[in-house]
Structures are given as structure tokens and as C-alpha cells.
């Protein structure tokens, strides 16, 4: 009598995941009585799939009626594919028994499932840096098999080199995670800038997914300050203006010292945009110089973005003016905002 | 529709023979592993014979020697041969069809009455 | 020869009841165990195979379970069509063995 063969046809068979995979297997012969079971791996802690014979295998369907006993087609249908469902997959025949004893095992089919990256995760330094300084964005993604895979990096629209990528694990996985960091040089035009991961896979048809993140993020643009005095007005009071200009962010807070002394302190809020994304800020002090004897040393005094105070001086010379006799005003905290947009 | 129709049974003498026929529809009886099942009247069921598809034979102790299990793939049908018969093999005899791949019983037919009585 | 015997040969049992016969192999016969169902006058009817898989047109309250040597036939609502003798049947090797019968009455 001839021997039982147990044929698997395919050596291998890709998938998308979310698809159904047919993995196909026929014997030559039903007799002797027994039940096919389809394992995944081989081996002691091999792990079964499908058997005929009882269980309950939700994904798991036969291609063919296995009711019909002139049927010699025990193929399976394994739906709703996972990268965890990867592996080589066994048909075996066994003779009933107590135990059923294993006789033939097919060659085996390995399954492959190609599963698209997961969206890329951008991700930039956690604490803001100031131009000239070179910060590190991280680009992530998941989940994607095979293992083939390219990533680059672009800053408004131009490739970045200074870019250390690494797909894990280095061996034979269900599938893998590639992670990557580039390392970018800020300037001060960079508040509206953008980074972008692009990720291309076999999954993708061409079309790569993106992961982006923005400058204006990571960077700080310290801002310039500048004090300057007006001409004096007819009621002896002196305008002094503090310029605050390309700053970013907004977050910012400006005191007026009156010879060491403060005087007001203002908050940054609601600030137009300058085209290059920073911001422009002008506060101005209205000083009655009648009410002092001594010149007066005017500071501006400006906190950006929880950084260390940044200070600019200006001495209005009081002895040129006249004094007003019993005047015992200090400066008036009267100055209201003004902005300037460039 | 899947069916299988005894027949052949009747009264006979002790030491008499019979020839017991079921007529197999619906499916290819060759395909199959087939059975003869026997219950005296008022008792339980007794595995009697069966033919594998291979055309391998088993038989009960009591009736080995004596009965011969046996097909017609041409006419779809099963026998079973009676020799010798006794007063022990009255019963009512069933043709039962093994399940696909386990053997396990999935059609019964309805049945043929044997006597054997002097 | 594989023995088979049932328990309990007779059972009592209310319409609605749920009602558990036993069966148990002389030696391991893996799960190759059936249930059938009788009636009187009438040929018996498959009901499940492999210790707990039911035959197509069997109705769910019918479940079987076990391993090895004990196994469990479960009705889980009796009705009146269910009142019946019950056969377990090993089948892992000839010769094939049945137990003796469990009949369900109603009470």
C-alpha cells in the first residue's frame, strides 16, 4: 500500500495583516482513521492551531467540508491576520488512538504578515534651547514586518545627515520597532520651522507616513532690549521706552525699576506675530523728573520664558530741569502699552 | 439526502443463514467506514462488525468465524453474511455509517428484524 | 475489550430538569466517545461525538464533556421529546463498546 504523504505545497505565504491567510495541505491518503491538526512551530512546544477532531478555533475555518469523507483537503483559513500569527505552520496526521499517535507531518508553511508602521511619533528635546544650540528630536514607529524599512528626516523640506536610526530586534521577530534621532541646528528663524519623519514600507504603496514636530517647540529666542528716553514734555515729564524685540515664546515679564526700586510690572499678552514667528514688545515709563533731586537710573528689567533676568539702564539727568517746590510725586505708573510690529 | 435501508432479515432456524443488505444513499458507501450494530429486544446496543474503506474487516468476538461483513461498490451497498446462526443473534440489526475522519457513528438505518427460532 | 458502564441505568426527572448521566471507560479512550439517543420502536440517533461535539441538527441543551476515562452527558432543559434511553459508545478501538443504557423517565 502506499505511503501516507501529507503535501503543504506552499514553503511560505505573506499576508496583510487584518487579511485571511490560506494555509493549504492535502494527504494522498484517509486511511488509517485519525484527525489532521495544523501546529504552528514544531516540536515539543509547538502550539495547535486547528484540530478537526474538537476545540473551538473562532479564526479558524476549514476551506473545505471536512464532513465529506472523500475529501482530502484539510486546508485551514486563519482570518484577521496579526504580525503575532507569524511563523511556520505544520499539518500532521495522527492515528486515532489513545493517544492519537502522530504518523506524517507536512513540510511546513511559514507564514509572513506585513503589517503597515504604526503613524511616526515625533517627539523633541523636553527643555527649550536657544539658537546656535543643537537639540534632538526622536522619531518612533511600530508594529511593521518585514523588517526592511527606511526613515529620513527633513527640516523644512530639506534631508538632515545628522540623523541615528535603529530597528529592533536586530533578529527574526513578528515584527519591529524603529526609533531614530536627529540632531538639529537651531537659528533664530527657526520659531517656524518644522521637522518631519518620514517612514516608507513595503506596506505603504509608496506612500510613507509622516510624523512631524515643530521648532517653535524647542526653541527660545532671547529677546533684544533697547531703553531710550523722548524728548522732555512741557509738564516735565519724561517718556522712557524699553523695546523688547524678536522674542520667543510669549511668555514674558517686563519690570520697571526706578533706582533699584520697582516700579511696575507688566505680563506679555496677546502680542501680534512678527512674520518670522517672534514677538515685539515696547513698554514705556512716564518719569516726572520735578519730583527728584538726584538723576534717576531707570531699568528695564525682563524675564523671558522662566529664564534669568535680562536688565537694560538708561539715567534721566535730573539736574538740568527745575525742581518744583513741595512736588513729591514719584513716577507716575501711568504708561500704558505701546506695540510695535516689524 | 443521506440514507441507508436495511433489509433481509426475517426468521430462520438455528444454524441457518441470512444475508443482511443495506442500500446506501445520498453518498459513496466505498468512502466510509461501515458498521452492522445489533439490539436484542429489550436490551442494549452491541457493536457487531465493521468494513474500513481500505477493505479491512473487524468482527465481535461472538459472531467471528461466523458472519462476514462485505460491500458492492457498484450497487452503494453493504452486507452482512450470517452463518451458523444462533438463538443469541436475534436482534434487531442496524447499518451505521463511520463518521469522516474518527469513525465516529453519524447515520443510522432504520433497521431489519432477525429471528432465529426453531 | 473496553468496558463501558453508565450511570445511573435509570433516571426520574421533571420537564424543565437538568439532568447529567455519567459514563465511564474500563481504560483511557482519549475523548473518542459518543452519545446517542433512543426512542421505542425506533433507531438511535447521534448526538455527539469526540466526548463533547455536537451532530449537526443537534439541539445545544444536549452537552458532553470529559477526557480519558469519565466523561458527562448534560440535558440542560428537559422537554418531553428528551424522555429516552441514552447510549455511550467508546470508539477508540475494536471492538466498539457501548454502555448499557441510561433510561430517562418523567416523573
Known amino acids: 500500500e502506499e505511503e501516507l504523504q501529507v503535501i503543504q505545497p506552499e514553503k511560505s505565504v505573506s499576508v496583510a495583516a487584518g487579511d485571511s491567510a490560506t494555509l493549504n495541505c492535502t494527504v494522498s491518503s484517509l486511511i488509517p482513521v485519525g484527525p489532521i491538526q495544523w501546529f504552528r512551530g514544531a516540536g515539543p512546544g509547538r502550539e495547535l492551531i486547528y484540530n478537526l477532531k474538537e476545540g473551538h478555533f473562532p479564526r479558524v475555518t476549514a476551506v473545505s467540508d471536512p464532513t465529506k469523507r472523500n475529501n482530502m483537503d484539510f486546508s485551514i483559513r486563519i482570518s484577521n491576520i496579526t504580525p503575532a500569527d507569524a511563523g511556520t505552520y505544520y499539518c500532521v496526521k495522527f492515528r486515532k488512538g489513545s493517544p492519537d499517535v502522530e504518523l506524517k507531518s507536512g513540510a511546513g508553511t511559514e507564514l509572513s504578515v506585513r503589517a503597515k508602521p504604526s503613524a511616526p511619533v515625533v517627539s523633541g528635546p523636553a527643555v527649550r534651547a536657544t539658537a546656535e544650540h543643537t537639540v534632538s528630536f526622536t522619531c518612533e514607529s511600530h508594529g511593521f514586518s518585514p523588517r526592511d524599512i527606511t526613515l529620513k528626516w527633513f527640516k523644512n523640506g530639506n534631508e538632515l545627515s545628522d540623523v541615528q536610526t535603529n530597528v529592533d530586534p536586530a533578529g527574526k521577530s513578528v515584527s519591529y520597532s524603529i526609533r531614530s534621532t536627529a540632531r538639529v541646528l537651531l537659528t533664530r528663524r527657526d520659531v517656524h520651522s518644522q521637522v518631519i519623519c518620514e517612514v516608507a514600507h513595503v506596506t505603504l504603496q509608496g506612500d510613507p507616513l509622516r510624523g512631524t514636530a515643530n521648532l517653535s517647540e524647542a526653541i527660545r529666542v532671547p529677546p533684544f532690549l533697547e531703553v531710550t528716553q523722548q524728548s522732555m514734555r512741557a509738564d516735565n515729564q519724561v517718556n522712557v521706552t524699553c523695546q523688547v524685540t524678536k522674542f520667543y515664546p510669549q511668555r514674558l515679564q517686563l519690570t520697571w525699576l526706578e533706582n533699584g526700586n520697582v516700579s511696575r510690572t507688566e505680563m506679555a499678552s496677546a502680542l501680534p506675530e512678527n512674520k518670522d514667528g517672534t514677538y515685539n514688545w515696547t513698554s514705556w515709563l512716564l518719569v516726572n523728573v520735578s519730583a527728584h533731586r538726584d538723576d534717576v537710573k531707570l531699568t528695564c528689567q525682563v524675564e523671558h520664558d522662566g529664564q534669568p533676568a535680562v536688565n537694560k539702564s538708561f539715567s534721566v539727568k535730573v539736574s538740568a530741569h527745575p525742581k518744583e517746590q513741595g512736588s513729591n510725586t514719584a513716577a507716575e505708573n501711568t504708561g500704558t502699552n505701546e506695540r510695535n510690529i516689524y | 439526502e443521506v440514507q441507508l435501508v436495511e433489509s433481509g432479515g426475517g426468521l430462520v432456524q438455528p444454524g441457518g443463514s441470512l444475508r443482511l443488505s443495506c442500500a446506501a444513499s445520498g453518498f459513496t458507501l466505498s468512502s466510509y467506514d461501515m458498521h452492522w450494530v445489533r439490539q436484542a429486544t429489550g436490551k442494549g446496543l452491541e457493536w457487531v462488525s465493521a468494513?474500513?474503506?481500505?477493505?479491512?474487516?473487524y468482527y465481535t468476538g461472538s459472531v467471528k468465524g461466523r458472519f462476514t461483513i462485505s460491500r458492492e461498490n457498484a450497487k452503494n451497498s453493504l452486507y452482512l453474511q450470517m452463518n451458523s446462526l444462533r438463538a443469541a443473534d436475534t436482534a434487531v440489526y442496524y447499518c451505521v455509517r463511520g463518521g469522516v475522519w474518527d469513525d465516529a457513528f453519524d447515520i443510522w438505518g432504520q433497521g431489519t428484524m432477525v429471528t432465529v427460532s426453531s | 475489550d473496553i468496558q463501558m458502564t453508565q450511570s445511573p441505568s435509570s433516571l426520574s426527572a421533571s420537564v424543565g430538569d437538568r439532568v447529567t448521566i455519567t459514563c465511564r471507560a474500563s481504560?483511557?479512550?482519549?475523548?473518542?466517545l459518543a452519545w446517542f439517543q433512543q426512542k421505542p420502536g425506533k433507531a438511535p440517533k447521534s448526538l455527539i461525538y469526540t466526548a463533547s461535539s455536537l451532530h449537526s441538527g443537534v439541539p445545544s441543551k444536549f452537552s458532553g464533556s470529559g477526557s480519558g476515562t469519565d466523561f458527562t452527558l448534560t440535558i440542560s432543559s428537559l422537554q418531553p421529546e428528551d424522555f429516552a434511553t441514552y447510549y455511550c459508545q467508546q470508539y477508540v478501538s475494536y471492538p466498539y463498546t457501548f454502555g448499557q443504557g441510561t433510561k430517562l423517565e418523567i416523573k
Open positions: 468494513i474500513g474503506t481500505a477493505g479491512d474487516t
Open positions: 481504560q483511557d479512550i482519549n475523548n473518542y
